[in-house]
């Protein structure tokens, strides 16, 4: 029997409770989104709550189950994929995570026409990647680093590549650095629009130095994980792109697509591939010194049976103030003439905007303009272009969806989302059906997320797909912190910040301040999104003020801010956090003796440097999986922003910007250093070197390692991590447990 005290006052205050750490760790207040799996202009698939795969037809309003949960369960399927001719479904099970995007799995093919699994010529296991052709039911898959093709699921496979070798040659899948820092996918193969051709990348890692670390497991001897991982300045993967005719794959075999001359003359990267038509493909290349990108449009020469990339179809994008693009070089969205395209790149004022390229980049027609940025082009149809930007009301941390009518002249612009649910929804993404007949809008906040379905012609809302009613009800008796997004103007720099305030915040009182920082190039922390997370709990229950600040190097506010950190990482990002803290102190409600900073990954680097800045502002801080020297991090990422660690390039700043160089300055702060020993991304080496430098300097500090955990510190480690950090902060701020 649980005795509850009777409510004396029926006031909201009494019925409400603060967030607990348990709420956060249990994911009690997590939200759902609804992204339709579009299969035509008016149909989509969705996995129902009871795990049936249901096909919805928007126009008829009908829905039916195409695959029962019973069939899914029979092979323990966690994912599925319908073939475009709707005759087969692949079922994915035995999911085994590798890196950020990559995983292996077992695949079963289910024949919808006879309700049976395809027997004979079954797929090998485990498969590294599998996908249907865009038309029909051809299958391409990667097994043991080689690519295979099936004309039909029951057919014997045709082996396309033969040189695949673990950690040496990767066909159709990226190696570690391409997966994490360039493609951001688990695959490196692309079907042409009608499935005639299959393009794929081959990565040769033969000469790349290997990172090796122990995986302790449960055995008597730990095993060693070896990953070809190019650190800054090291030998990089060698990439080649091939295309094979999938109708007659044995006829001429894979044909290599040439690299543009100005790219091939020195080390380079392949950055993306976009099919335009079945016989026209667009490849993007990038010099190793990443300020020059070349977009090359290549055509299939029937008479030659090869791919021709004329000089006239090479388009160069060059940055004179930083690196090419934002985080990545943007990809083109082709128009219906199959040669002109829309692309986001910096305009003359240094803001990323949509441009229309018909012949040369020099003659590009600017489609959007202003002191804000176009962020993503979702879809181009015959008469409309849909994109997202942060233009509305001049808040860089918002995302609204716009439609530009390109069929009429002059083109007219309409904000589709700006006034839909103005208070609740200021940060949107979208998902479009074929020909943009319909689209789903997914709103991430600042209110409770909501997903809705819309008519692509009229923009009319058709229905709510997910509104998180249960979450809304669950939060009714929770004292959530207050959030505000504002800006500071300092020395011609605008510093946007988000402040998370305790529920009963009183400006006349003094509160401990925690800075949460990421601060990496082209990142954005100050966003109008909903979140109930660890910092929400710290504000709600522990009475802390938490602030997030977007300083120099962050995105979507123009190139001046973005490229300010070019070739000098670890300087301005730290300065701007410090500047913001000083401004917060001036506001009068911060207890300046109780200020902390914490961050993860790049944020761990920034928090470490801030703690070691010698300002005396911070009492304590936490670095989770920090970078400690840019010489230890991946070439593709690091060199984009820092150049090469060579004497004639930028070695001096590589050396000056390490955490270790500032070991002495940690003497007067409480520092908690945390890292997973099996971090494939930011290697444990980084924290090992910080610890060594602190020991050598005889500086006391606290540390926690997580055995066999990667950069994400997932599972039970998450609970331990946040509990541990909470204790550390409460001790630092003299808060009772």
């Amino acid at each position: 029997i649980v005795l509850r005290p009777s409510r004396v006052h029926n006031s909201e205050e009494n019925t409400m409770r603060a967030l607990t750490l348990k709420d956060i760790l249990n994911g009690t207040f997590s939200y759902k989104t609804f992204f339709p799996n579009w299969i035509s202009g008016q149909e989509y698939l969705h996995q129902s709550a009871d795990n049936n795969i249901v096909l919805y037809n928007i126009e008829t309003g009908q829905s039916y189950t195409i695959l029962s949960n019973r069939t899914m369960k029979s092979v323990n399927a966690s994912n599925y994929g319908l073939s475009p001719d709707r005759q087969f479904v692949y079922l994915e099970s035995d999911y085994s995570k590798l890196w950020r995007y990559s995983y292996t799995a077992t695949y079963y093919i289910y024949d919808l026409s006879n309700g049976e699994f395809v027997r004979g010529n079954e797929l090998p296991r485990p498969i590294q990647y599998l996908c249907w052709s865009p038309v029909g039911s051809k299958l391409a898959y990667v097994y043991q680093n080689n690519i295979y093709l099936k004309q039909r699921p029951g057919d014997p496979p045709f082996q396309i590549t033969f040189n695949g070798r673990e950690n040496k040659i990767f066909n159709g899948i990226p190696d570690w650095v391409y997966e994490e820092e360039m493609l951001a996918t688990k695959y490196a193969l692309w079907w042409s629009p009608n499935g005639k051709f299959l393009a794929y990348a081959e990565f040769n890692d033969t000469d790349i130095p290997v990172i090796a670390y122990s995986y302790y497991g449960d055995e008597q001897y730990p095993r060693t994980i070896n990953i070809p991982y190019p650190k800054a300045g090291a030998k990089n993967p060698v990439v080649r792109i091939f295309i094979i005719d999938t109708t007659y794959p044995a006829y001429v075999g894979p044909q290599e697509v040439p690299v543009p001359a100005m790219i091939a003359s020195s080390d380079y990267y392949f950055s993306w591939l976009t099919w335009v038509t079945d016989e026209r493909v667009c490849l993007q290349w990038l010099k190793r010194v990443q300020n020059v990108s070349v977009l090359s449009i290549c055509d299939f020469r029937e008479d030659w049976q090869t791919w021709d990339c004329p000089k006239t179809q090479e388009h160069i994008e060059e940055s004179r103030t930083g690196w090419a693009g934002g985080f990545f070089v943007s990809t083109p969205v082709f128009s219906y003439d199959a040669i002109s395209y829309y692309k986001i790149f910096s305009d003359k004022d240094g803001y990323k905007h949509i441009h229309y390229i018909k012949d040369t980049v020099e003659n590009a027609i600017q489609i959007t303009s202003g002191k804000w940025e176009a962020i993503n082009i979702f879809r181009v149809t015959q008469d409309s272009l849909f994109y997202s930007s942060n233009e509305f009301e001049e808040y860089p941390g918002r995302r609204n969806i716009y439609r530009i009518s390109i069929g009429s002249y002059p083109p007219s612009k309409k904000c589709v989302t700006c006034h839909l649910r103005k208070e609740r929804c200021q940060y949107y993404t979208a998902s479009f059906s074929d020909y943009a007949k319909y689209y789903a809008l997914v709103c991430y906040g600042p209110g409770i997320p909501i997903s809705t379905l819309h008519d692509g012609r009229t923009d009319q809302e058709i229905k709510i797909l997910e509104e998180n009613k249960e979450l809304e009800n669950a939060l009714k008796n929770i004292q959530l912190p207050k959030e505000e997004i504002k800006k500071l103007e300092v020395d011609e720099i605008t510093l946007w910040y988000k402040m998370i305030l305790p529920p009963q915040f009183d400006r006349s009182k003094k509160y401990p301040l925690l800075i949460q920082v990421y601060g990496g190039p082209c990142s954005q922390s100050v966003r109008s999104v909903f979140a109930v997370n660890w910092i929400s709990y710290l504000a709600s229950k522990e009475g802390m003020v938490i602030a997030l600040v977007d300083g120099r190097g962050t995105a979507f506010q123009g190139d001046k801010l973005l490229y300010a950190v070019y070739r000098k990482l670890g300087v301005y990002e730290v300065e701007d956090q410090i500047t913001a803290v000083r401004k917060f102190i001036e506001m009068g409600f911060i207890d300046e003796k109780r200020i902390a900073i914490w961050g993860w990954s790049y944020g761990g680097y920034v928090s470490s440097l801030a703690l070691a800045s010698g300002t005396g502002l911070f009492k304590c801080g936490i670095a989770v999986a920090p970078v400690s020297s840019w010489e230890y991090y991946a070439s593709v990422y690091t060199e984009r922003f820092m150049g090469l660690p060579t004497k004639d390039d930028n070695l001096e700043h590589y050396k000056n910007s390490t955490v270790m160089a500032r070991a002495e300055y940690f003497r007067n702060v409480d520092y908690l250093l945390i890292h997973g020993t099996a971090d494939d991304n930011v290697h444990f080496q980084n924290s090992a070197q910080i610890a060594k430098a602190l020991v050598n300097a005889q500086v006391d500090f606290q540390a926690m390692w997580y055995s066999d955990q990667n950069h994400g510190l997932s599972g039970l480690s998450t609970n331990h991590l946040y509990t541990h950090m909470t204790h550390f902060l409460k001790q630092c701020f003299s808060l009772s447990d």
Epitope: P258, W304, K311, I316
Partner: antibody, heavy 119, light 109 residues
Framework: DVQLVESGGGVVRPGESLRLSCAAS????????MGWVRQAPGEGLEWVSG????????YYADSVKGRFTISRDSSNNTLYLQMNSLRAEDTALYYC????????????WGLGTLVTVSS | EIVLTQSPGTLSLSPGERATLSCRAS??????LAWYQQKPGQAPRLLIY???DRATAIPDRFSGSGSGTEFTLTISRLEPEDFAVYYC???????????FGGGTKVEIK
Amino acid sequence: DVQLVESGGGVVRPGESLRLSCAASGFTFSSYDMGWVRQAPGEGLEWVSGIRVSGGSTYYADSVKGRFTISRDSSNNTLYLQMNSLRAEDTALYYCAKENDRHSFFEYWGLGTLVTVSS
Amino acid sequence: EIVLTQSPGTLSLSPGERATLSCRASQSVGYYLAWYQQKPGQAPRLLIYDASDRATAIPDRFSGSGSGTEFTLTISRLEPEDFAVYYCQQYYNNWPPLTFGGGTKVEIK
């Protein structure tokens, strides 16, 4: 009609410099990649250098790398070849040539200008 | 660097005869090969590009064939004005260095 007229050739001593010019007319100079090809007396053709429209990329044969510099001035439709540290083996008839817009073969050639390097 | 070898060095033929000139590449150049004609005291003139496409105003007695590493220029019936030196040039993927063959001299027998 496409016309390419080279000038600037002459007799120089080893180690000296020379600047060749090529005046182009009859086509949109700024839209085409250009190159220099040379022919030593009684010998075959040797590609020397090329310059791209896009990005202004420049390319050189190994035999002249670091000594020769190709450039262009689209305002007066002129291609240049700055030749420093000249050697006896640079003695040749130097042709200015217009590349095809799609591929790097030479559609039109000038009549050439003779460079003689002799002590 | 891709090396082009032309053969024969000299071809002695009479007007009206068929001339077959060969150009061999040290590695595959696909179809990226051009042929030029050069007469004494004159600049080279483009005859064939992309291995087999005739340039503007080139008579159809000139034809090119081949791909990869083996290429042929054929002059079906030699005219008096065809006696000259012929050069092949590769421009594989438009990559420098562009290279020329050593030339074949077609002379009157």
